[in-house]
């Protein structure tokens, strides 16, 4: 069964997925897709990495952690009710049928009506539209658009909270952290 994660409309959703690479430059390809993991690959791919690079991502999906160390946790920016459902994190270990597949269920809750937004959690305004790239080279040698402006203090605070959260620990405990090499 899928591990369940929750996010509110307008917030950023966090879907953890981890592995341990043999070395920071010798990575395992990973794909994220909308929908349960199929037999091969990912369906409806929203983000993909290869042995070295993040070579495909779209405007609302990006990696929060250091993917060179195997933190391929997905952030979905500014979620809507349409974002609910199953997401597949597939760690594409070389060899026949060696892939590690994790299905994560995202449940979207309606936004709470509050007198004022909580600043620490509500930082989606800090993100302009992210470019879509398919491995076009160094970031500012591209002409596809701007990369996301991220408030690092807020991100770091959120990352620390998530790192300590029971959900992240539950995922690790359920086997979503694997060692490669």
């Amino acid at each position: 069964s899928e591990v369940e994660y929750r996010a509110e409309v307008g917030q950023n959703a966090y879907l953890p997925c981890f592995y341990t690479p043999a070395a920071p430059g010798n990575l395992v390809p990973v794909c994220w897709g909308k929908g349960a993991c199929p037999v091969f690959e990912c369906g409806n791919v929203v983000l993909r990495t290869d042995e070295r690079d993040v070579n495909y991502w779209t405007s609302r999906y990006w990696l929060n952690g250091d993917f060179r160390k195997g933190d391929v946790s997905l952030i979905i920016k500014n979620v809507t009710l349409d974002d609910h459902g199953i997401y597949c994190c597939r760690i594409q270990i070389p060899g026949i049928m060696n892939d590690e597949k994790f299905n994560l269920k995202l449940v979207i809750k309606p936004a709470k009506v509050t007198p004022a937004p909580t600043r620490q959690r509500d930082f989606t305004a800090a993100f302009p539209r992210m470019l879509t790239t398919r491995g076009h080279g160094p970031a500012e040698t591209q002409t596809l658009g701007s990369l996301p402006d991220i408030n690092l203090t807020q991100i770091s605070t959120l990352a620390n909270e998530l790192r300590d959260s029971r959900l992240a620990n539950d995922l690790r405990d359920s086997g979503a952290t694997i060692r490669i090499g």
Partner: antibody
Framework: QVQLQESGPGLVKPSETLSLTCTVS??????????WNWIRQPPGKGLEWIGY???????NYNPSLKSRVTISLDTSKNQFSLKLSSVTAADTAVYYC?????????????WGQGTLVTVSS | EIVLTQSPATLSLSPGERATLSCRAS??????LAWYQQKPGQAPRLLIY???NRATGIPARFSGSGSGTDFTLTISSLEPEDFAVYYC?????????FGQGTKLEIK
């Protein structure tokens, strides 16, 4: 346009700790996907990658220097820093800070001007 | 780690001539090779990434080729500002490594 600028003492005594700071201006320090690196170049020699820090604070170091290197981040000042302990004359070099992005890992598209650090008593 | 060997160590040419610089890897780096230009007192500048792709703002006279273990940086017609030291760098295997450089000097 992003700019990187190194600063720190130009002279360090043997066995002491070398400390340098890189200040990033032009906006990209607050963008996800960027890695902030230190690279050095001994006089008349080639370049050597020292290590990186990611915005989350995650670090990674060259195995040849790992036991002596610490890279840290100060997001409030748009700075990241290098500390290299127990230095010897072999650590005399021009030290550069540089940036790469996860869409083209380890391809360093922006560099600081470099700062010469001499290890001598 | 992968060792990159650049040749020649020094290349003496005149403006307008064609320059060919070589970089050889101790093992295959596929196409994961970059070239940088460094002038005295300045930081390295990215010219070519992934063997053959010019970085932003790099003139068309600079081109890169090769794959596997043998790579070439070609400057089709040398301009006075091209005389500098050129480094290759691989990103195929960790840690990333650089060559020792080729000095391109005016004859």
């Amino acid at each position: 346009q992003v700019q990187l600028q190194e600063s720190g003492p130009g002279l360090v005594k043997p066995s002491e700790t070398l400390s340098l700071t890189c200040t990033v201006s032009g906006g990209s320090f607050s963008r996800g996907g960027y890695y902030w690196n230190w690279i050095r170049q001994p006089p008349g020699k080639g370049l050597e990658w020292i290590g990186y820090i990611y915005y989350s604070g995650s670090t990674n170091y060259n195995p040849s220097l790992k036991s002596r290197v610490t890279i840290s981040l100060d997001t409030s000042k748009n700075q990241f820093s290098l500390k290299l302990s127990s230095v010897t004359a072999a650590d005399t070099a021009v030290y550069y800070c540089a940036r790469d992005h996860y869409s083209s890992s380890w391809t360093f598209d922006y560099w600081g001007q470099g700062t010469l650090v001499t290890v001598s008593s | 780690e992968i060792v990159l060997t650049q040749s020649p160590a020094t290349l003496s040419l005149s403006p307008g001539e064609r320059a060919t610089l070589s970089c050889r890897a101790s093992q295959s780096v596929s196409s994961y090779l970059a070239w940088y230009q460094q002038k005295p007192g300045q930081a390295p500048r990215l010219l070519i990434y992934d063997a053959s792709n010019r970085a932003t703002g790099i003139p068309a006279r600079f081109s890169g080729s090769g794959s596997g273990t043998d790579f070439t940086l070609t400057i089709s017609s040398l301009e006075p500002e091209d005389f500098a030291v050129y480094y290759c760098q691989q990103r195929s295997n960790w840690p990333p490594t650089f060559g020792q450089g080729t000095k391109l000097e005016i004859k």
